[in-house]
């Protein structure tokens, strides 16, 4: 037999075994020009010493073979003895290691069998009614195709599916979408309506994420507030990576899960922008304000479940940094200015009340005054901090108030509102004899003592009603009792107590009269 012809004799090897795990497979035969044809196949297993034979049976009942040697591709013409206008059955027999393995057969009309390409280029993936929709441009001059897909997950083998007939310039396929695992898809095509036409090769992998992105399992920690009034948010635990099928490992466009950090600054609600979304890799610096932080996972199908944390406000207070002067026109606060052209947010809320009741005021951008101070003033009519109670004040600063991550904490402190000097006056002053020349003076704590750092000291004044001599005794803010000694029996005294703040002298309590009785010895 001539090598260019199909040999109508017995092949030069024994009968073929029934199928084995190795051997020839995926036989494809098609016309490649007006009078030439090509068959190609794959061979699984060791290739050393393997000889391949392309077998062909005609509709007449005669069978022949081409010897391909070690090649897995063979071309022949329409003069090779194979009928190209009628149906033929072709298969491959591979002779190796004293045994013959055979491929599955294909039955086709060679003249009408065109080499079909798999979907080429960009395969668009979208979600449609809980299913996956893939769409691609039909390869040139190949309108009219049957399309199959195969898919696998990281833990399951390939499963075959059918896309149905296609007859347009774009082709599409509806495939199953997994809820929680990534999938790898491949597609192949063959000529529509051509009996036994060969399938194309499988397309490149299409990697598809699960419908639900994995919930981010991350933990945060927040550093101490630094000198600049900012603290770093750090990620303690990276989000778990999605397990991918074999063909999607390494570079797998389509399965990416993006994690975004959504910051919501709860403090200072009067600022322009309260939320900001960042990439998880870029951990921000925060002010000492309270924040809610959410990590949102999303893939090409949209966002998944998010995980939310609350970052409480930094409650470290600066008892001396804020200077408050109360005048007839209103109240002015002074604090060390941060820099030129800073916007400040002054937030206050009654101590012991829910954080949701905070009030705030945003200043216009301001430069430091000659003393290097920034100021905020308000009138009595505004009602700001007007009630006689303890307020917690925080001042935030930013050169770019529209950028949530550029706020810093200037200071946090306490302030007693309203007419503090009168409201702070101690009540229930009582005097008890202590010894022959001393008494113990007690009083109820001033309202100012409920406000940490506000009450600087108590002052107890004792007046000798005879000589009109007055003595004043400072008392620590934590004490509510003092012993007055060196008193004379039979003399009338009055005692008063006042509570002072760092910037305000208190109002004296009502005078309390007392005297030490003269002791008469028997």
């Amino acid at each position: 037999c001539r090598t260019s012809e199909c040999c109508f004799q017995d092949p030069p090897y024994p009968d073929a075994d029934s199928g084995s795990a190795s051997g020839p497979r995926d036989l494809r035969c098609y016309r490649i020009s007006s009078d030439r044809y090509e068959c190609s196949w794959q061979y699984e297993g060791p290739t050393a010493g393997v000889s391949h034979f392309l077998r062909c049976c005609l509709s007449s009942g005669r069978c022949c073979y081409f010897a391909a040697g070690s090649a897995t591709r063979l071309q022949f013409s329409d003069q090779a003895g194979v009928s190209v206008l009628y149906t033929v059955t072709l298969w491959v027999e591979s002779w190796a290691r004293n045994q013959t393995e055979k491929s599955p057969e294909v039955t086709l009309q060679l003249y009408n069998s065109v080499k079909y390409e798999p979907p080429l280029g960009d395969i668009k993936v979208s979600k449609l009614a809980g299913q996956l929709r893939m769409e691609w441009e039909t390869p040139d001059n190949q309108v009219g195709a049957e399309v199959q897909f195969r898919h696998r997950t990281p833990s399951s083998p390939w499963k075959l599916g059918d896309c149905g007939p296609q007859d347009d310039d774009t082709e599409s396929c509806l495939c199953p979408l997994e809820m929680n695992v990534a999938q790898e898809f491949q597609l192949r095509r063959r000529q529509l309506g051509s009996q036994g036409s060969s399938w194309s090769k499988w397309s490149s992998p299409v990697c598809v994420p699960p419908e639900n992105p994995p919930q981010p399992q991350v933990r945060f920690s927040v550093e101490q507030l630094g000198q600049d009034g900012r603290r770093r948010l750090t990620l303690k635990e990276q989000p778990t990576q999605l397990e991918l099928p074999e063909g999607c490992q390494g570079l797998a466009p389509g399965t990416e899960v993006t994690y975004r950090l959504q910051l919501h600054m709860l403090s200072c609600p009067c600022k322009a922008k309260a939320t900001r979304t960042l990439h998880l890799g870029k951990m921000p610096y925060l002010s000492g304000a309270a924040y809610n932080v959410a990590v949102i996972s999303s893939n090409q199908f949209g966002p998944g479940l998010n995980q939310t944390w609350h970052i409480p406000a930094d409650t470290h207070t600066e008892p001396v940094a804020l200077n408050i002067s109360v005048g007839t026109n209103g109240t002015t606060m002074y604090w060390p200015a941060r820099a030129q052209s800073m916007t400040y947010c002054i937030e206050w809320q009654p101590v012991g009340q829910d954080g949701g009741l905070a009030t705030c005021s945003l200043t216009a951008p301001q430069d430091p005054d000659p003393a290097g101070m920034a100021t905020y003033s308000w009138s009595r009519e505004s009602g700001a901090m007007g009630q006689e109670k303890c307020y917690y004040i925080t001042i935030f600063a930013s050169a770019h108030p529209e950028k949530l991550t550029l706020w810093s904490t200037v200071l946090s402190t306490y302030h007693f509102g309203g007419n503090a000097s009168a409201a702070g006056t101690p009540h229930h002053v009582s005097v008890k004899n202590h010894s022959l020349d001393s008494v113990s003076v007690d009083w109820a704590p001033s309202l100012l003592s409920t406000c940490p750092g506000v009450l600087k000291e108590y002052v107890v004044r004792c007046r000798d009603e005879d000589s009109k001599q007055v003595s004043e005794h400072p008392v620590q803010p934590t004490e509510t009792q003092v012993t007055l000694s060196g008193l004379r029996a039979g003399v009338a005294y009055t005692v008063q107590v006042r509570a002072d703040t760092a910037w305000l002298r208190g109002v004296w309590s009502q005078p309390q009269r007392f005297s030490i009785e003269v002791q008469v010895s028997d």
């Epitope: 109508f8 004799q9 017995d10 092949p11 009968d15 073929a16 077998r55 049976c57 007449s60 009942g61 005669r62 069978c63 022949c64 073979y65 059955t89 298969w91 027999e93 055979k102 057969e105």
Partner: nanobody, 111 residues
């Protein structure tokens, strides 16, 4: 001269088995398609199974899983192993290759 000779037919009870042989001379079973046909009285002849080039096998739907066609190239013979026989399998079974036919062998399935 091409000849095909069938043997192995006979009477068998329902559920039983038979093995038919088709001895071929003049052509090789490895370079041709060998078919087994059957014809029941008053019915059309129908293709039961075929073997192509001694390797590729095809079956009619109603015998799939019950009948097996095979070849032995050393003996140049094609076999039809018939299991789970039914009364409706009763017919004359003939083999053919190219345009040549054997004379046929009778298979009767009856209790």
């Amino acid at each position: 001269e091409v000849q095909l000779v069938e043997s192995g037919g006979g009477l068998v009870q329902p559920g039983g088995s038979l093995r038919l042989s088709c001895a071929v001379s003049g052509i090789s079973v490895r370079s041709s398609v060998v078919n087994w046909y059957r014809q029941a009285p008053g019915k059309q002849r129908e293709l039961v199974a075929l073997i192509m080039g001694g390797a590729i096998t095809k079956y009619a739907d109603d015998v799939k899983g019950r009948f097996t066609i095979s070849s032995d190239s050393a003996r140049n013979t094609v076999y039809l192993q018939m299991n789970s026989l039914r009364p409706e399998d009763t017919a004359v079974y003939s083999c053919s290759a190219l345009e040549y036919w054997g004379q046929g062998t009778q298979v009767t399935v009856s209790s």
